[in-house]
Every structure is written in structure tokens, then in C-alpha cells.
């Protein structure tokens, strides 16, 4: 039975040209995390695998940095980066847990972090 929950940074906003850290945390399970996939809509951004380490999409090689931890740092943000991001935790023996983050990239300097929320 899948008992874990994923806590994410929730709905967040950031300034155009700036950077943002996307973070997810898996808790309430003893399952082993074998791989975390980061996706934007249907596009794979990066993979962090327990054996193979980090691998970043060539399409984002200059704007995505691994970490901190299992998180992902997006740099040189543009308005086109606005949208949904997903952290997909592949675990053994539980299976797959998915967290959702919504990022809004703002033209102005009024960029505030939203509240954290949990996805069971």
C-alpha cells in the first residue's frame, strides 16, 4: 500500500530573468527512492537516478541546474516558463508518487511565494 505523501513548494511566482528552486519532499514512507523525474507539462526536464546521478535535458542544459537535493533550479526565467511542473518519484516497493508545482513568471518585481501544500 502506498502510504507516502509528497510535499511541494506549491504555487510559486518569480521574476522574469531570475531563478527559482522547485522542491518536492517525499515523507511518511520507508520506500526507497530509485529515481526522480522532473517534467514541465509533457516535457522531461531532468532525471536524478540513484545509480546514474543527474541528467539534464539538452533543451534546457543552459537554464536548468540540478539540486539542491532532489530539487531543480530553473534559471534565466522567461514568461514562457509559466506553467505546471511535476516531480515524479519512482520508489520501491511503493511505486510512483507525483507532486505538482505551479510556477508563474512575472514581468514585475512583485513575486511572492505561495503556500506549501501536500499531494497524498
Amino acid at each position: 500500500m502506498m502510504t507516502g505523501t509528497i510535499e511541494t513548494t506549491g504555487n510559486i511566482s518569480a521574476e522574469k530573468g531570475g531563478s527559482i528552486i522547485l522542491q518536492c519532499h517525499l515523507s511518511s514512507t520507508t520506500a526507497q527512492v530509485t529515481q526522480v523525474n522532473w517534467e514541465q507539462q509533457d516535457q522531461l526536464l531532468a532525471i536524478c537516478n540513484a545509480d546514474l546521478g543527474w541528467h539534464i535535458s539538452p533543451s534546457f542544459k543552459d537554464r536548468v541546474a540540478p539540486g539542491p537535493g532532489l530539487g531543480l533550479t530553473l534559471q534565466s526565467l522567461t514568461v514562457n516558463d509559466t506553467g505546471e511542473y511535476f516531480c515524479i518519484y519512482h520508489t520501491y516497493p511503493d511505486g510512483t508518487y507525483t507532486g505538482r508545482i505551479f510556477l508563474e513568471v512575472l514581468e514585475s518585481s512583485v513575486a511572492e511565494h505561495g503556500a506549501r501544500f501536500q499531494i497524498p
Epitope: 523525474n37 532525471i47 537516478n49 519512482h90
Partner: antibody, heavy 120, light 107 residues
Framework: EVQLVQSGAEVKKPGASVKVSCKAS????????MHWVRQAPGQGLEWMGL????????GYNRKFKGRVTMTVDTSTSTVYMELNSLRSEDTAVYYC?????????????WGQGTLVTVSS | DIQMTQSPSSLSASVGDRVTITCKAS??????VAWYQQKPGKAPKLLIY???NRYTGVPSRFSGSGSGTDFTLTISSLQPEDFATYYC?????????FGGGTKVEIK
Amino acid sequence: EVQLVQSGAEVKKPGASVKVSCKASGYTFTDYYMHWVRQAPGQGLEWMGLVYPYNDNTGYNRKFKGRVTMTVDTSTSTVYMELNSLRSEDTAVYYCARGGPSNWNYFDYWGQGTLVTVSS
Amino acid sequence: DIQMTQSPSSLSASVGDRVTITCKASQNVVTAVAWYQQKPGKAPKLLIYSASNRYTGVPSRFSGSGSGTDFTLTISSLQPEDFATYYCQQYTLYPLTFGGGTKVEIK
């Protein structure tokens, strides 16, 4: 036209090492991951690992960890796969294969293959 | 590791036949599945990626479908040049893994 041209067939003794090359042309070499896949005679396909010429980042199938090394020479657009401590079961055709543009973990172009025979 | 179980391992068919090959993943791989065609002594060639996207230059008689754990490659009307071995591959989780292959032979 994208081309991946591999080095010629090799015959090696058990315990020896082999280094296979794969020269890429027809595209921007540092924009795509390169993978190595092998196929034993009459058998299926087995993924060995990947290397990213942009930053030399590698990842190896745990089955080969400690025995395989993948390297890059960007000046000649060539990737290399070296396999150590050869045994008879390493007899196979070794292919380099380029990672796809939308996801780097499927293979859109393949080299012609290099037969490595391990025999005493 | 994710096991990709292909069936059948071989089949005999005639030119013009509709051929279906299935691939079952041991866990959910969403739609991260590719299909390849390999002829004797040659490297594999990409046919389908993302479970259902036909690769550039691949004839429309080849189609892929499925998501989750069950995937299908269909050849709507088998042509003489289609006699070959077909492999599925998952690319959701490392290590990347292939099915055992399906050899399509002439009846």
C-alpha cells in the same frame, strides 16, 4: 545527414580490455546524449549507459559499473566505450546510438555496430 | 529494473496481413515506450516513440498505442520489407530496458 561511424571488429582474450569508437557527423555533437547498447549473438538488446558530450556527464547500467567507461573527444566529435575484464559472455555487437531530441532516452540514430569477440 | 515482456516471440504472416505485437511493462511507464525494427546484420531503426508518435519517414502502416503497462505495435498491411525483428523499449526509468523481440517471418 546524421551519421554514426564505429570502429572495426575486435578479437580479445578473456581479461583484456576493448575500446570502441563512434564518430558522429551531420549534427551539433554537444547537443545530444550518446548511448551504448549491445547485442549478444542471436539475443536481444541491452543498454549499457550514456554520455553527454556537452559536459562529459556519464551514467552506467549497474550491471557494467566498474567495468565500463564512456568518454568523449569533442575536437573530433567522437565518443568511446571501453569495457574491461572481458569474459566470453561479452561477445556481442556494440552499438552507439544517439538520444532523441524530445527525450534523450530513446534512440533516433544508430551506428553500424562493432563486433567484439572474446575468445581464448 | 523494469521488465518489458514482448509477445509473441515470433510469428508467421503473409504480405497484406495485419500484424499486432504487444509489450507489457512490469510497472507503469506512462507513454515512454519506443519501438524499433531490426533486420539481420543491421542496426535497429526507430519506428515509434512516446508510445504512439511515428518517427520521421516511417510508413503510415506502422502505428503504436498504449499507456501505463500495455503497449501495441500494429502493422496494418504487412509489406515484404517488414519481415524483421521488432523490439520495444521503455525509457521512463534507468536502466533503460528492451523487450525480448518479436521475429516476423514469412508464412
